[in-house]
């Protein structure tokens, strides 16, 4: 059988290295060798490349080497496949070297900010040594912030006469580390070089970008003062590297600026003790280059009625996220504040909050929350400077079986009845939502019985027991992940009724 006709011929000119052609089929059933015929010097000269030896038979690739790699030039290529039964020739193909030239990547040697020019990096590189001297090169510059996985790209060209191999990348974020990589190609070529080695540069620092500001209102003290826990953080979109030297806080009762008080702190939280009136609070961060824009918060009067607009809320888990969604009766509200913290018996050690705009859902990566911990999640509607009533829910990102079962006791033991009571498992040991309790009880040498009750029941009366009989009993608390038995207790029913 004749070999298959070589097809899909593809050639690439590795500048000053070789001119390589590949084709299909890559493998033949029988031993096949190939001859690649070439004309070069604009058709004036010819030569061949052959896979005509034992090490290269059946190999659908061949390379022409210097000194006959001429540029610029047009090459004509034909591939002949030969086996014991005969020869099959490909169609003749034509290659303009300028269009298929691949050169070495450039080498970035500096990525620097330029003094006094904000949000810009100047990239300097060395043009590849193995590139035609006179040709215009096109470039793709890829860049990303150091903690991002997503590359952005910008394309540009450089004439050879430019010799100034620099590019100014503008509209970046202030004081942010960027990773850069560069590739190039002759302007007419379809083949790009590989990417250069990555280089990192940092844009110039500026005055802080801004703050997100929130509060926790605590119950009024006996003297009438209200503790208000202020908290703030870098605004969303602020540079990762941004560092504040400190924070200035000033606050005053509404319409009474002459009672302004000021505080300076280096912390990102501060407790104020306010009267019962409405107060305005302002916070700025500052560094050596200036102050951030002012973050403003209105603290409502003690007796102020807050609006309510969240009607329902659901928390659900996806593969790797916790998603909280809510429904609202107020279409004009498009900003929401989400608070979340672990539901523990003691004071929560970590309190987190985040603003949500133009959405009625909030997502968090599961790995940002601890498994087996219950989280309280509250959503506050924010309409201009007013904060509405929150709507709260609880969620686990991963449930487990309780770490301990319920502590149980037998009360009111009768002839045929007993009342069993048990304590709620401490929050830290639940490891999930308790969905029910199961009471297991068994007479001495008798059959085991069980009774399952809802999670809101902490007491149960067992009936139809046998008089003057010893029983063992334990209560199991169950989450979605499974159950854990509490301590086993023993009791004996009475022989006669005691009035």
């Amino acid at each position: 059988v004749l070999p298959a006709k070589p097809e899909n011929i593809s050639c690439i000119f590795y500048y000053e290295e070789n001119f390589t052609c590949t084709w299909s089929p890559e493998k033949e059933a029988s031993y096949t060798w190939y001859k690649v015929k070439r004309t070069y010097s604009y058709g004036y000269k010819s030569d061949i490349c052959s896979t005509d030896n034992s090490t290269r038979g059946n190999h659908a690739s061949c390379s022409f080497l210097p000194p006959t790699i001429t540029n610029p030039d047009n090459y004509t290529i034909q591939v002949e496949a030969q086996n014991a039964d005969g020869i099959m020739k490909s169609d003749i193909t034509y290659w303009n070297l300028d269009a298929i030239m691949k050169i070495e990547p450039p080498e970035i040697f500096s990525v620097k900010s330029v003094l006094g020019i904000k949000r810009m990096l100047q990239i300097k590189w060395i043009r590849p040594v193995l590139a035609p001297h006179s040709s215009t090169l096109k470039y793709t510059l890829r860049f990303r912030t150091i903690n991002s996985a997503y590359w952005m790209e910008v394309n540009f060209t450089k004439e050879d006469i430019d010799r100034d191999e620099t590019y100014n990348l503008t509209e970046l974020q202030a004081f942010t580390e960027y990773v850069m990589t560069l590739r190039c190609a002759p302007a007419e070529s379809m083949f790009w070089s590989g990417w250069s080695q990555e280089k990192v540069g940092t844009t110039e620092e500026e005055a802080p970008y801004g703050l997100d500001l929130w509060r926790v209102l605590k119950p009024a003290m006996v003297d009438g003062r209200r503790p208000v826990q202020l908290m703030w953080k870098k605004a969303t979109g602020a540079p990762v590297l941004e560092k504040a030297l400190g924070y200035n806080i000033w606050y005053f009762p509404e319409n009474n600026t002459n009672l302004t008080e000021t505080v300076n702190t280096t912390n990102q939280t501060h407790e104020l003790y306010l009267g019962g009136k409405t107060y305005w609070v302002y916070v700025v961060s500052y560094n050596s280059l200036g102050e951030s824009p002012v973050a403003t918060l209105r603290i409502p009067a003690l007796n102020e009625k807050t609006f309510q607009c969240i009607e329902a809320m659901q928390a659900c888990l996806t593969q790797d996220q916790l998603v909280v969604e809510w429904q609202s009766s107020a279409p004009e509200v498009d900003t929401w504040m989400v608070e979340w913290f672990p539901d523990v018996d003691s004071e929560p050690s970590s309190f987190s909050w985040e603003s949500v705009s133009q959405a009625r859902n909030w997502t968090i990566q599961k790995d940002e929350l601890k498994p087996l911990w219950c989280y309280n999640i509250s959503v506050y509607p924010v309409l201009r400077d007013r904060v509405g009533q929150p709507y709260s829910t609880q969620a686990y990102v991963q449930e487990g079986i309780p770490s301990a079962g319920p502590v149980t006791q037998a009360d009111s033991i009768g002839v045929k009845t007993v009342t069993i009571t048990w304590k709620e498992i401490p929050k830290s040991k639940r490891n999930g939502f308790i969905k029910n309790y199961t009471i297991f009880y068994q007479a001495e040498d008798g059959k085991e019985f069980s009774k399952t009750v809802n999670s809101n029941i902490l007491q149960y009366r067992l009936e139809s027991l046998t008089r003057r009989t010893s029983y063992s009993l334990q209560v199991m608390a169950s989450t979605n992940a499974g159950g854990t038995n509490g301590t086993k207790i023993n009791f004996k029913t009475l022989s006669i009724s005691v009035l």
Epitope: K35, K37, T39, S41, Y42, G43, Y44, K45, S46, D47, I48, C49, S50, T51, D52, N53, R56, C62, S63, F64, L65, T68, T76, Q78, K89, I92
Partner: antibody, heavy 131, light 108 residues
């Protein structure tokens, strides 16, 4: 037997045209470049024109550029020379020659240099341009 | 175009003598692209040497070629009666391909 046979020569007036043919046999025609060479009796050889195996023109002697056109028909194993605007100085014996095959000259590995020469010649056809 | 100048125009020698023919190019020619042909009256040219120094099939070893750049030489170590003919050099390095004007080797 490898053979080249030229035809189409004759007497033509200045400014006239002729089409020479060269019929090839005994070898795989489309593997080879071909050339036309002319010789004025008692004088030297002059390369006129050539065509490579792929059908691309190798070039023309300065003296015939723009007037002569070389072509080939691989299906019929034939080489042609279309001669227009003929002049008295084009009078000569026109020889068809086979270029060197695409083989030999092993550089090592898989790459083969192509050494250039004309290894097979026809007997020629005479063109006379005269008024 | 590359002009090839052959010298001498005519070389008169006796059989058994050594013949040295010169071919000088107006610009450098790659040694791979220089060829020598022999032509006898009434016959087509015959390939002798290709690539400056490689003998064609069937050519006796008394014929040898050498040279590089712009100067090339064909040497016939001991002339035989059948060697008396016209010898042409040709270059393939640049378009158009060109022949030298020929050197006639005649019997003295």
């Amino acid at each position: 037997e490898v053979q080249l046979v030229e035809s189409g020569g004759g007497v033509v007036r200045p400014g006239g045209s002729l089409r020479l043919s060269c019929a090839a046999s005994g070898f795989t025609f489309d593997d080879y470049g071909m050339s036309w060479v002319r010789q004025i009796p008692g004088r030297g050889l002059e390369w006129v024109s050539g065509i490579n195996w792929a059908g691309g023109t190798i070039g023309y002697a300065d003296s015939v550029k723009g007037r002569f056109t070389v072509s080939r028909d691989d299906a019929n194993n034939s080489l042609y020379l279309q001669m227009n605007s003929l002049r008295a100085e084009d009078t000569a014996l026109y020889l068809c020659a086979r270029e060197s095959p695409l083989r030999l000259g092993d550089l090592g590995g898989d790459y083969f240099y192509y050494y250039y020469y004309m290894d097979v010649w026809g007997k020629g056809t005479t063109v006379t341009v005269s008024s | 175009e590359i002009v090839l100048t052959q010298s001498p125009g005519t070389l008169s020698l006796s059989p058994g003598e050594r013949a040295t023919l010169s071919c000088r190019a107006s610009q450098s020619v790659s040694s791979r692209y220089l060829v020598w042909y022999q032509q006898k009256p009434g016959q087509a040219p015959r390939l002798l040497i290709y690539g400056t120094s490689s003998r064609a099939t069937g050519i006796p070893d008394r014929f040898s070629g050498s040279g590089s750049g712009t100067d090339f030489t064909l040497t016939i170590s001991r002339l035989e009666p059948e060697d008396f003919a016209v010898y042409y050099c040709q270059q393939y390095d640049n378009s158009p391909r060109t022949f030298g004007q020929g050197t006639k080797v005649e019997i003295k």
